[in-house]
């Protein structure tokens, strides 16, 4: 806490400029009017204040706006934003995408800090949902943003926002998240033709059910192995050898290299060895010829 002392004669700041870097902490406190600072906040970013001086400037704004800063100040915080705590940010009401962008720019190229996470949370909650423009902005700054949300939070993403999602934005998503995103993507891209649809939906297929994979196998999509390996195991298991062959097209040969990994390994165990042999890939581990396969789960469901 900086003591309240009178400003020395002739030192009262008329504007926020570089002369202030020569002020001691107490002089800044005494000689800089908080309202002046608020209106000329954008100038702070061009002045090499010390860390201690920044603390004084922040303290002045905190005193002027005890309930939280107005958006006109927030938008021009610049690197002073990095001095804010999550508690400070929780008091803010940020509604403008421009303000959000300005603050994200300050932290650009670095992992999401607690300050940024709190800011985004406040912004999204204020909007009520993750609209396309917001998602566009957030994934541009933080490609992993979408996958940092819980399935519950993802449920507020409208299907129209899915158009903003790039494949790399989904790299770190787990199956639970893709389960939520896939139906939204299916809805968003439903009016596209076959090949275009597949290009768009491909990144989301980790959440696709068996019936959708079966449908895709009828469309000559030539799914690559990397995509196939990300499919839900429970969705892949019921697929026949013929369906997998159609789904993968020329990429089917890649199954051999993945035969020890899920979901390929588990799928092989469910197929007749005869059927696997028709692929000519030397896949082993299928059900030997002459064995009867009872689907006990189906039997339980019927009873």
């Amino acid at each position: 806490e900086v003591e309240k002392t009178a400003c020395p004669s002739g030192k009262k700041a008329r504007e926020i400029d570089e002369s202030l870097i020569f002020y001691k902490k107490w002089e800044l406190e005494a000689c800089v009017d908080a309202a002046l600072l608020a209106t000329q906040m954008d100038r702070v970013n061009a002045i090499p204040f010390t860390y201690e001086q920044l603390d004084v400037l922040k303290h002045k704004l905190d005193e002027l706006y005890p309930q939280g800063y107005p958006e006109s100040v927030i938008q021009h915080l610049g690197y002073l934003f990095l001095k804010m705590s999550p508690e400070d940010i929780r008091k803010w009401n940020v509604t403008s995408l421009e303000t959000l962008k300005a603050l994200l720019e300050v932290n650009k190229g670095h992992e999401m800090s607690p300050q940024v996470a709190t800011l985004i949370d406040r912004f999204v909650k204020g909007r009520g949902q993750l609209d396309k423009d917001t998602l566009d902005t957030l994934t541009a700054f933080y490609p992993g943003y979408l996958c940092s949300l819980s399935p519950e939070e993802l449920s507020s993403v409208p299907p129209s926002s899915i158009w903003a999602v790039r494949p790399q934005d989904l790299d770190t998503c787990d199956p639970r998240q893709l389960d939520v995103l896939y139906p939204k993507a299916r809805l968003a891209f439903q009016n596209m033709n076959g090949s275009e649809y597949f290009v768009k939906i491909q990144s989301f297929l980790g959440g696709a059910p068996t019936e959708d994979l079966k449908a895709l196998s009828q469309q000559n999509v030539s799914m690559d192995l990397a995509t196939f390996m990300k499919l839900r195991t429970d969705a892949v298991l019921p697929l026949t050898v013929a369906e997998v062959q159609k789904l993968l097209g020329p990429h089917v040969e890649g199954l051999k290299a993945e035969e020890r990994h899920r979901p390929v390994r588990d799928w092989i165990l469910r197929q007749r060895q005869d059927d696997l042999d028709t692929l000519g890939l030397g896949l082993q581990g299928g059900i030997p010829n002459g064995y009867l396969v009872l689907d006990l789960s189906m039997q339980e469901a019927l009873s």
Epitope: A46, P48, T50, Y51, Q53, Y79, L82, N107, H110
Partner: antibody
């Protein structure tokens, strides 16, 4: 006068960890930011990391992100660099250096401590 | 990340010469640029900050200029003590990047 003294360097095997320290005196340590900069033998300077005066913000060069952690103890006037998963290319003299604000240069430097990563 | 490119990498000069080293940033850094001098086995020493401000105690024969992406360090009257390696460095709120260095050697 300002003094920065690094310690903790030595020979370490690839994959192992090491912690460097930098003891500061002659200035108000808790008021200033601190950096680590390294210099591989016969090479140029490479900035490694910065930590703000109160420890609230830490930033790293891409080459060490996820492996190195910068920290400070203001009560002990000491800066640290925890280096994990060390690689041969981390071999260098490591300097600590002070900055007075986010838009300040590195005005005081220690004499450095040598870290050699070799099997 | 902001890249800093220095030229030349080596410079041969004689005592009394005027020497100029240039530094180019991959994007605008305003005037947030420093110059350092380093002698073998020693820590770097700050010469110039904010592109043209002379650090206290540094001889006035050293000067800096430039803004945005193009910067220069000039030594107006090279002295025997000035033969060393010089580095430019950009600095901002969360990172610093050095140029690869310019070695000034005796011709």
């Amino acid at each position: 006068q300002v003094q920065l003294v690094e310690s903790g360097g030595g020979v370490v095997q690839p994959g192992r960890s090491l912690r460097l320290s930098c003891a500061a005196s002659g200035f108000t340590f808790s008021s200033d930011g601190m950096n680590w900069v390294r210099q591989a033998p016969g090479k140029g300077l490479e900035w490694v990391a910065v930590i703000w005066n109160d420890g609230s913000n830490k930033y790293y060069a891409d080459s060490v992100k996820g492996r190195f952690t910068i920290s400070r103890d203001n009560s002990k006037n000491t800066l640290y660099l925890q280096m994990n998963s060390l690689r041969a290319e981390d071999t260098a003299v490591y300097y600590c250096a002070r900055d007075r604000g986010p838009l300040w240069p590195l005005d005081y430097w220690g004499q450095g401590t040598l870290v050699t990563v070799s099997s | 990340d902001i890249q800093m490119t220095q030229s030349p990498s080596t410079l041969s000069a004689s005592v009394g010469d005027r020497v100029t080293i240039t530094c180019r940033a991959s994007q605008s850094i305003s005037r947030w640029l420093a110059w350092y001098q380093q002698k073998p086995g020693k820590a770097p020493k700050l010469l110039i900050y904010k592109a043209s401000s002379l650090e206290s105690g540094v001889p006035s024969r050293f000067s800096g200029s430039g803004s945005g992406t193009e910067f220069t360090l000039t030594i107006s009257n090279l002295q025997p003590d000035d033969f060393a390696t010089f580095y430019c460095q950009q600095y901002n709120a969360y990172s610093r990047t050095f140029g690869q260095g310019t070695k000034v050697e005796i011709k």
